[in-house]
């Protein structure tokens, strides 16, 4: 995880020694670099990246996705709603990142780094959001049964699931990064 530096962030109207905006920005870019490396292995290993049968696998997944109502797009932007969505989405992605562990041969360490860096990012963002409404955490029991279900899929579906998780996580982080730059 790349080291961060503190900055002079102030949550209006009170000055707070919050996490730095630079640290959040760098952390997201670091995770995106990791995802690129994992996608490279996935695409080299199978033809999933060109597959048109994604809908079959997507039926089993409920991957977090940015929608207009989440307030993270330029149109209808709402910083507080958006920040809550980013944190909630990252928390929901954690089970899928756990699934990615052991799905890679040459990039096993990279998969672990993406998972651990995401945990750190969530901590940074929770500090930034500490004046906002409580953020709901996914139910561990539900996550455990989802993980079991995903791991029980056939090889083709597991490959497709891996591809879809990486693609969705990349899109989610890119949208998050754009929105967070305004905050």
């Amino acid at each position: 995880v790349p080291p961060g530096e503190d900055s002079k962030d102030v949550a209006a109207p009170h000055r707070q020694p919050l996490t730095s905006s630079e640290r959040i920005d760098k952390q997201i870019r670091y995770i995106l670099d990791g995802i690129s490396a994992l996608r490279k292995e996935t695409c080299n290993k199978s033809n999933m990246c060109e597959s048109s049968k994604e809908a079959l696998a997507e039926n089993n997944l409920n991957l977090p996705k940015m929608a207009e109502k989440d307030g993270c797009f330029q149109s209808g932007f709402n910083e507080e709603t958006c920040l809550v969505k980013i944190i909630t989405g990252l928390l929901e992605f954690e089970v899928y990142l756990e699934y990615l562990q052991n799905r890679f041969e040459s990039s096993e360490e990279q998969a672990r780094a993406v998972q651990m860096s995401t945990k750190v990012l969530i901590q940074f963002l929770q500090k930034k959001a500490k004046n906002l409404d409580a953020i709901t955490t996914p139910d561990p029991t539900t996550n455990a049964s989802l993980l079991t279900k995903l791991q029980a899929q056939n090889q083709w579906l597991q490959d497709m699931t891996t591809h879809l998780i990486l693609r969705s996580f990349k899109e989610f982080l890119q949208s998050s990064l754009r929105a967070l730059r305004q905050m």
Partner: antibody, heavy 119, light 106 residues
Framework: EVQLVESGGGLVQPGGSLRLSCAAS????????MSWVRQAPGKGLEWVAK????????YYSDTVTGRFTFSLDTSKSTAYLQMNSLRAEDTAVYYC????????????WGQGTLVTVSS | DIQLTQSPSSLSASVGDRVTITCSAS?????MYWYQQKPGKAPKLLIY???NLASGVPSRFSGSGSGTDFTLTISSLQPEDFATYYC?????????FGQGTKVEIK
């Protein structure tokens, strides 16, 4: 036309206060963070402060922290810089600038308003 | 705070010349921007996020670099390009600017 218009500058004595306004027009104000940047006569540019689009987060340079306050009135598409305990070294043209969506770039700037702190 | 040093501080050039301005940071920066300012006017964004051309800016302007060393290049100087150019960085707050480079007519 997309534009920012600053007002409120003028001559003020050291220790005095002034409130600058920055009125936005030609674009939807709500998704953009705003910054103030100043330029002392014949000198370079110095960033002063930033406010997030809804006003939840503000950032200040060390030189103005505790003296200046950045606020918004989104219903009026206007940003304000309340400047207290003014010093001679605060004398400058003050520009407000919009932050480009998805970037930290300051892409639209006002024409500036001159603040002179002198006795 | 991160210090930005531009070089040269001023230069004389002719229309059609290729002009290069450099910006050196005291430590590695996350994002670099370039601005043009004419006397009595507000700065105008030319390049954002290292190398992206801002909307409405002619393609003769280009930006490059990473880490601590960055360059603004004007491939063929035009009469309207005589101005002062500033680099600006963001790596957390505060934003900081270079001291400026004045491009004058030879």
């Amino acid at each position: 036309e997309v534009q920012l218009v600053e007002s409120g500058g003028g001559l003020v004595q050291p220790g005095g206060s002034l409130r600058l306004s920055c009125a936005a027009s030609g674009f939807t104000f709500s998704p953009f963070a705003m910054s103030w940047v100043r330029q002392a006569p014949g000198k370079g540019l110095e960033w002063v402060a930033k406010i997030s689009p809804g006003g939840s987060w503000t950032y200040y340079s060390d030189t103005v922290t505790g003296r200046f306050t950045f606020s918004l009135d989104t219903s009026k598409s206007t940003a304000y810089l309340q400047m207290n305990s003014l010093r001679a070294e605060d004398t400058a043209v003050y520009y407000c600038a919009r932050q480009l969506w998805g970037s930290y770039a300051l892409d639209i700037w006002g024409q500036g308003t001159l603040v002179t702190v002198s006795s | 705070d991160i210090q930005l040093t531009q070089s040269p501080s001023s230069l004389s050039a002719s229309v059609g010349d290729r002009v290069t301005i450099t910006c050196s940071a005291s430590i590695s920066v996350s994002y670099m921007y370039w601005y043009q300012q004419k006397p009595g006017k507000a700065p105008k964004l030319l390049i954002y996020d290292m190398s992206n051309l801002a909307s409405g800016v002619p393609s003769r302007f280009s930006g490059s670099g990473s880490g601590t060393d960055f360059t603004l290049t004007i491939s063929s100087l035009q009469p309207e390009d005589f101005a002062t150019y500033y680099c600006m960085q963001w790596s957390g707050y505060p934003y900081t600017f270079g001291q400026g480079t004045k491009v004058e007519i030879k």
